[in-house]
């Protein structure tokens, strides 16, 4: 909200950089049957470039990734068969970020 | 991604707390009745509530919030000349978090 | 460690209901499910259902299917499990389990006796 | 549903006996089984999953084998805080099942 002039610091730009951000698992894992019964856990946390940058035409862009692997553990229940999975989740952590034109491709690295 | 097992570390949950987000201080935010200027800075840090719960029915909720007012710069842009004013935008802070179920209603402290 | 505590004995009525507590502690609630197993007299154990802590999803066996009530109440860790239209042989002993693949931790179980 | 079925349904046994029951299921459960020791007046308490593993903490005297249709737990040398009964049950399909159980006692 717009108030007026109060006791307020001065903003302080969101730098370009990596926050910890959440990431939900159970909807990327849930299947159309809806077998699932159990999903743990349902999120996790992961690292992300986030905040902005100087200009309109640049944004805040990871210049190098890293994928990390976690085991989620899932019960699903197919035809009464319940199945015990211990699956592997790849998870993207941005380790690096930059202030990039719009058209620039992102690099992976 | 879903992969077959790996050496991958058990999946921790992102629990319910506060973590820095980044928001942006859109211009309408400052001035709905004239586009003819620019805000700095374009975004800043809150804290807010994120993470997941133990259960689907409940959802990590702000339990105190809290204003805090910052000054922005306003540019505005008149017969092609800047013009320099300040304002002041409220941001909301949360300050602690809990599970709470969907239904009930937020507290704002 | 590890502890699910149960509710204590319950004498009850034929066609009465009755609702056992599972308390759990020690552990993430959600990332288990809570199983119900029951032991009448003397006799082998018998598995009624389980529920996911996470979701409240349920699975019954058939003989229990329509008058067993499984819930979940993530914000104590509590589990529940009810039981409608009591008869003589519903008298056991119920027992919560925390479940997996297996029933690794078990409740000290609950005596519920059907009497007239 | 899957019946499973125990034998003997009690035996006698001396200490530093080897002990062997054997639970047949009606289907096949791969290794889909595990092994449970209940002594009187109490819980039941999980001894072996996935019909071979044994749980933490538990005496490696106990042990479990088998897949299919036919598992066997052995008890390599009996003790006489092992007197108990004890419970195979399958998790290959819903519902879960046990079977009827063993009671070992001393003689």
């Known amino acids: 909200s717009l108030g007026s002039l109060t006791i307020a610091e001065p903003a302080m730009i969101a730098e370009c950089k990596t926050r910890t951000e959440v990431f939900e698992i159970s909807r990327r894992l849930i299947d159309r049957t809806n077998a699932n019964f159990l999903v743990w856990p349902p999120c996790v946390e992961v690292q992300r470039c986030s905040g902005c940058c100087n200009n309109r035409n640049v944004q805040c862009r990871p210049t190098q990734v890293q994928l990390r692997p976690v085991q989620v553990r899932k019960i699903e229940i197919v035809r009464k068969k319940p199945i015990f999975k211990k699956a592997t989740v790849t998870l993207e952590d941005h380790l690096a970020c930059k202030c990039e034109t719009v058209a620039a491709a992102r690099p992976v690295t | 991604s879903l992969g077959s097992l790996t050496i991958a570390e058990p999946a921790m949950i992102a629990e319910c707390k506060t973590r820095t987000e980044v928001f942006e201080i859109s211009r309408r935010l400052i001035d709905r009745t004239n586009a003819n200027f620019l805000v700095w800075p374009p975004c800043v840090e809150v804290q807010r509530c994120s993470g997941c719960c133990n259960n689907r029915n409940v959802q990590c909720r702000p339990t105190q919030v809290q204003l805090r007012p910052v000054q922005v710069r306003k540019i505005e842009i008149v017969r092609k000349k800047p013009i320099f004013k300040k304002a002041t935008v409220t941001l909301e802070d949360h300050l602690a978090c809990k599970c709470e179920t969907v239904a009930a209603a937020r507290p704002v402290t | 460690q590890v502890q699910l505590v149960q509710s204590g004995t319950e004498v009850k009525k034929p066609g009465a209901s009755v609702k056992v507590s599972c308390k759990a502690s020690?552990?993430?609630?959600?990332?288990?499910?809570i199983s119900w197993v029951r032991q009448a007299p003397g006799q082998g154990l018998e598995w009624m259902g389980w529920?996911?802590?996470?979701?409240?999803?349920?699975n019954y066996a058939q003989k229990f299917q329509d008058r067993v009530t499984m819930t979940t109440d993530t914000s104590t860790n509590t589990a529940y499990m009810e039981l409608r239209g009591l008869k003589s042989d519903d008298t056991a002993v119920y027992f919560c389990?925390?479940?997996?693949?297996?029933?690794?931790?078990w409740g000290q179980g609950t005596l519920v006796t059907v009497s007239s | 549903d899957i019946q499973m079925t125990q034998s003997p349904s009690s035996l006698s046994a001396s200490v530093g006996d080897r002990v062997t029951i054997t639970c047949q299921a009606s289907?096949?459960?791969?290794?889909?089984l595990n092994w449970y020791q209940q002594k009187p007046g109490k819980a039941p308490k999980l001894l072996i999953s996935?019909?071979?593993t044994l749980e933490t903490g538990v005496p490696s005297r106990f042990s479990g084998s088998g897949s299919g249709t036919d598992f066997t737990f052995t008890i390599s040398s009996l003790q006489p805080e092992d007197i108990a009964k004890y419970y195979c049950?399958?998790?290959?399909?819903?519902?879960?099942?046990f079977g009827p159980g063993t009671k070992v006692d001393i003689k």
């Open positions: 389990a925390r479940a997996w693949n297996s029933f690794d931790y």
């Open positions: 020690g552990y993430t609630y959600g990332a288990y499910a």
């Open positions: 529920i996911s802590a996470y979701n409240g999803n349920t």
């Open positions: 289907q096949d459960i791969r290794k889909n």
């Open positions: 996935d019909a071979s």
């Open positions: 049950q399958q998790y290959y399909n819903l519902p879960f099942t």
